[in-house]
Amino acid sequence: DIIMRPSCAPGWFYHKSNCYGYFRKLRNWSDAELECQSYGNGAHLASILSLKEASTIAEYISGYQRSQPIWIGLHDPQKRQQWQWIDGAMYLYRSWSGKSMGGNKHCAEMSSNNNFLTWSSNECNKRQHFLCKYRP
């Protein structure tokens, strides 16, 4: 049987059953999530659930830029240091860089410090690039 690889929306890239859209617009975390949702298909800010997925995303983004942090779908909505993925994925894979020094940093970004392979917490009202994800 010929199995057709699902197609992603124009400008999005495909990896292991998911489509990813990298947006170099500046949005705060919640506006970025709303914009991801607006693209339909059940899209949200991206969950990153394995090193393989992280590496693929990092490689893709590095082709565009290497200095700007990028919002992902991990946040601490109740501000209790109980982080969760906005798309409901389990919080099993973690790739935090170092220790948080607190101060109302309740949203997660891919950090440019380690070629986008590690995450940092930041203030959710910061306006940054963002990464969306959906399953086609």
Epitope: Q78, K79, R80, Q81, Q82, W83, Q84, W85, G88, M90, Y91, L92, R94, W96, K99, S100, M101, G102, G103, N104, K105, H106, S121
Partner: antibody
Framework: EVKVVASGGILVQPGGSLKLSCTAS????????MSWVRQNPEKRLEWVAE????????HYPDSVKGRFIISRDNDNHILYLQMNSLKSEDTAMYYC???????????????WGQGTSVTVSS | DVLMTQTPLSLSVSLGDQASISCRSS???????????LEWYLQKPGQSPKLLMY???NRFSGVPDRFSGSGSGTDFTLKISRVEAEDLGLYYC?????????FGGGTNLEIK
């Protein structure tokens, strides 16, 4: 050495107000979620208030909501609990508690102060 | 609110024996992120409570390996494999997955 020292507990009449303080030392206070937990004379524990590291988010159980206010002074490493409209059932030992965390992963209330006793009685 | 029910209320154990304390929640206490924030605390006579276990089965630093935690969903257990004199006191389970966080009523461990 991590220390959290609560103070301010006294005998107060029903309907009265009281402000508890907790002075923290030995850790980066501004990086930790903090709570107040109380223990009544029957030894039952009850979580009564929580505040996030930056001080802008708070949580309370229904039993104290609208009467108690938790706040913090990160510059001076002090946690507060303003208690208003006190009732006899608020009589308890009040503990100041640190939430253990790396910032990315909560792992329990790892340091408890020695407690300060509040008695509400006429 | 999540009701946490501990059994037994009191437990009398000989030194060297095993002790087991049960904690049952009125609903599942897995957080939306998949983690179960279930903790155990010990309050020794005249002292403040101290953290023993977090996230069901993780021992806090300095806690002896004779303490172990297990369970999932709504049923959790704290076991002390070989009870020592210093283990006496009040044991509390605590769920911090759902607001408001809630404690069990406590189990008093006595030495025979």
């Amino acid at each position: 050495e991590v220390k959290v020292v609560a103070s301010g507990g006294i005998l107060v009449q029903p309907g009265g107000s009281l402000k508890l303080s907790c002075t923290a030392s030995g850790f980066t206070f501004r990086s930790y979620v903090m709570s107040w937990v109380r223990q009544n004379p029957e030894k039952r524990l009850e979580w009564v208030a929580e505040i996030n590291d930056g001080g802008s988010y708070t949580h309370y159980p229904d039993s104290v909501k609208g009467r108690f206010i938790i706040s913090r002074d990160n510059d001076n490493h002090i946690l507060y609990l303003q208690m208003n409209s006190l009732k006899s059932e608020d009589t308890a030992m009040y503990y100041c508690v640190r939430h253990g965390s790396t910032g990315y992963d909560y792992f329990g209330m790892d340091y408890w102060g020695q407690g300060t006793s509040v008695t509400v009685s006429s | 609110d999540v009701l946490m029910t501990q059994t037994p209320l009191s437990l009398s154990v000989s030194l060297g024996d095993q002790a087991s304390i049960s904690c049952r929640s009125s609903q599942t206490i897995a957080h939306r992120n998949g983690i179960t924030y279930l903790e155990w605390y010990l309050q020794k006579p005249g002292q403040s409570p101290k953290l023993l276990m977090y996230k069901v089965s993780n021992r806090f630093s300095g806690v002896p390996d004779r303490f172990s935690g297990s369970g999932s969903g709504t049923d959790f257990t704290l076991k002390i494999s070989r009870v020592e004199a210093e283990d006496l006191g009040l044991y509390y389970c605590f769920q911090n997955s759902h607001l408001p966080p809630t404690f069990g009523g406590g189990t008093n461990l006595e030495i025979k």
